[in-house]
Every structure is written in structure tokens, then in C-alpha cells.
Amino acid sequence: FGISGKHFITVTTFTSAGNIGEDGTLSCTFEPDIKLNGIVIQWLKEGIKGLVHEFKEGKDDLSQQHEMFRGRTAVFADQVVVGNASLRLKNVQLTDAGTYTCYIRTSKGKGNANLEYKTGAFSMPEINVDYNASSESLRCEAPRWFPQPTVAWASQVDQGANFSEVSNTSFELNSENVTMKVVSVLYNVTINNTYSCMIENDIAKATGDIKVTDSEVKRRSQLQLLNSGP
């Protein structure tokens, strides 16, 4: 949400998700102000004493930063004057999930907005033809997911068919004991058909497509974050 009106500026945040062990971005924009030295950006997290990050007078001020964020945060300093208060977060952890507030003060006024930050793991699936199997089968693998996702298969030819009886899905814990590798095998596949492997949890949905013909194998995969936006 944003606050507007006299002496208030509009601040907009976007609900987003962080992939654990990677960089994350907490998105926040505000009405630009060419006077960089007059801009104050504060990021706060619900339940945490101290600040997540503070930027003022054209530079970072970490004097009130909570220890769990030390060395892990930065604003995009060159984009602050154009109204970008987004925060870069290093090495996202499960514990980084929660409600954050982006607070802005400029020469035009002040405003704030909250965002819900979800953390988990999500990755692109890769589908390959499994020639080792007794019958032609497809193997769908995705290296990192958390929480445990659901896996479903679909086919262009047999739309609406339930493949749960002819598929086998396993989840293997990765070395850091949080995320899991997803492996799903679909048996008795036919050529000249397009199959889709869909992996989904409450953070992301990923789909891998494979088209097998006599002459070639075509693959495509995509990943979308769920509930992302203002």
C-alpha cells in the first residue's frame, strides 16, 4: 500500500520471493527527487529491532543495522535519484522471510509501504528422454526446491489425462539439508507428442516441455513466481 496526500509521497512495493543461497531483491519505488542528499531510505523488518538498511545523504548508514543483515544489503545507489529504493539482499536465507517496510523521506514529503517477502527454493526443470528404461520414458529433473513441491505431468495429445499411475516422483535432500532435488519419471510415452512436467509450490511454478518426434527432440522450460506484484 502507499500513502499519498499533502506532505506525503507515494511509495510502491512489490511482493517478491527470494531463492535461498542466491541474491534477492526487495522492490520499492517512490516519487523521484533530484536532491540526492535530501533522500532518506529506511528498510525495516517486522519483529527485528534495528534497521535492515539505511541510505541517507547520498550514502549507506549502517550504524543502526541489525547484525543479521550486516554485509548482506545494498541499495542501487545510482538509481535512488530516479526513485528506486529497492534493496539487494545477499545469500537469501529462509529466516529472511517476513514483512518489510520501505520508508522514504525526501524534500517533497514522506511515505512508506509494506511488502511480504517469501523465501524458498525454485529452479528450472530439465526433461530428457530416458533410454535406459525398459520402455520409452521421460525424466524430469529440477535441482533445488523448497518447500516440497507437487509434480504433475500433462500431454498435448491426451489432454486431461491423469498420469499419476504411470509416473514416479522422488525428492532427494540436497547437501545443505534444506532444499531438495526433484526427479519425476514418466513411463510409456509415445512419440509425436508434447509432454509437460509441472513443478509447483507456494512460491513458484515451473514447467518443462518436451516434444519427441522421430527426427528430433525439442525442449522448453519456464519459471514464474507466484503472487508477485504490487
Partner: antibody
Framework: EVQLVQSGAEVKKPGASVKVSCKAS????????IGWVRQAPGQGLEWIGD????????NYNEKFKGRATLTRDTSTSTAYLELSSLRSEDTAVYYC??????????????WGQGTLVTVSS | DIQMTQSPSSLSASVGDRVTITCKAS??????VAWYQQKPGKAPKLLIY???TLQPGVPSRFSGSGSGRDYTLTISSLQPEDFATYYC?????????FGQGTKVEIK
């Protein structure tokens, strides 16, 4: 252009202390972490620790805790490494390096020329 | 603390060869692995960070990849100026750690 200029070579006796300086220019000194790395003759790189000049916050390799002290002087844009209770195995080239990513501790992207510290009786 | 085990410790190769150096992290997952090149008497030079991002000015024959605990530096076609020692660095955690180094020598 980012530049890190280190102090000259030092020869010290076992048990003594040494203070190596690293003067930064070409960027806002208080906005980037500065790391320290050493390299013994013919050996690999060893991370000692780092400091955020904007607040004086530090991180240390367990191996050097209690013996290494990282400080900074923001008025001269200079970072310091002091190593006490020197022994012969501390003979090494000591490097300072700026960490990429400003207040975010990134990889070391710009390096000083190195300072040779020799510990010998 | 995370340790980085680098291999091989040395290798001999010829100009034009494809060279692969690996680093294995002792635990955990994060993408914060960087690769450095060091020549005798010189400071290390950053080649790659965040597993696969090429530092500006570094030739495209250098590439990085990896996930989980295993990370790789590849030189697609070794050039005369590439004979040097290479180090990986883990910088995702509070405590940073270098690999032991790989010396690339002329065969």
C-alpha cells in the same frame, strides 16, 4: 579509477607487531568493505578478515582472531592491518582489497600492490 | 567454516587447449564463488564472480559454472597469457575462504 596503495616492506623480529596501511582513492572509502589477504612464499591465498570503513564493523578468520586487528581512518581514507606476536610463519605478502557491492560484502575486485612482511630473528 | 577444495593442484596444457579447474565446497549451497588469476609477483585479478558472471574486461574464453557444492572455471582455448595460478573464493558466508590454487603450466 579505484586505487589501493599499500605501505612498504617490513622486517620484524619474532614476537613483535607490524602495522600495514592501505590508502584508498577513486571511490567513496566509507561505502565499501576492505578485505585483507596474505600469501606466504610459494603458498596460496589466505583470507585474514575485512572491515567496513563506514562503521568500523569487522569479520575475522578464526585463525587470526586475537592476533589481527583491522582499523581505519576515514579522514585519510586509509585501512590498517596490525598483526601482533609475529612468528616466522607470518612471513608473507599482505594484500588489501576492496570488496565489490558497497555495503554488500562481495568478491574482492580491486587489489593493492602487496606489502612483504618478513619475520626473522 | 566452509572449506574450498580445489583440483587439480597443477596441470600442464598447450596453447589452444580447453582447461577445466574445479572447486568443491565442504558444505551448503550458495552461488557466491569467484575465480582469480594470479601471475608471479602480482596481485590476484578477479575473473568471475557469483559463479558465472564475467568481470568487465575479462576475455570471454573464461567461463564459470556450478551449483550445489561443485564449481568450475573453464578456459575454452588457452592463450599464452593464461599460464598462471588460479584460485576460487567462497564469499557467501561470514567467513571467506580460498581454494588451494591450481597452477597452469606450459606442456
Amino acid at each position: 579509477e579505484v586505487q589501493l596503495v599499500q605501505s612498504g616492506a617490513e622486517v620484524k623480529k619474532p614476537g613483535a607487531s607490524v602495522k600495514v596501511s592501505c590508502k584508498a582513492s577513486g571511490y567513496t572509502f566509507t561505502s565499501y568493505w576492505i578485505g585483507w589477504v596474505r600469501q606466504a612464499p610459494g603458498q596460496g591465498l589466505e583470507w585474514i578478515g575485512d572491515i567496513y570503513p563506514g562503521g568500523g564493523y569487522t569479520n575475522y578468520n578464526e585463525k587470526f582472531k586475537g592476533r589481527a586487528t583491522l582499523t581505519r581512518d576515514t579522514s585519510t581514507s586509509t585501512a590498517y592491518l596490525e598483526l601482533s606476536s609475529l612468528r616466522s610463519e607470518d612471513t608473507a605478502v599482505y594484500y588489501c582489497a576492496r570488496l565489490d557491492g558497497s555495503s554488500y560484502r562481495g568478491a574482492m575486485d580491486s587489489w593493492g600492490q602487496g606489502t612483504l612482511v618478513t619475520v626473522s630473528s | 567454516d566452509i572449506q574450498m577444495t580445489q583440483s587439480p593442484s597443477s596441470l600442464s596444457a598447450s596453447v589452444g587447449d580447453r582447461v577445466t579447474i574445479t572447486c568443491k565446497a565442504s558444505q551448503g549451497f550458495n552461488k557466491y564463488v569467484a575465480w582469480y588469476q594470479q601471475k608471479p609477483g602480482k596481485a590476484p585479478k578477479l575473473l568471475i564472480y557469483y559463479t558465472s558472471t564475467l568481470q568487465p574486461g575479462v576475455p570471454s574464453r573464461f567461463s564459470g559454472s556450478g551449483s550445489g557444492r561443485d564449481y568450475t572455471l573453464t578456459i575454452s582455448s588457452l592463450q599464452p597469457e593464461d599460464f598462471a595460478t588460479y584460485y576460487c573464493l567462497q564469499y557467501g558466508n561470514l567467513l571467506y575462504a580460498f581454494g588451494q590454487g591450481t597452477k597452469v603450466e606450459i606442456k
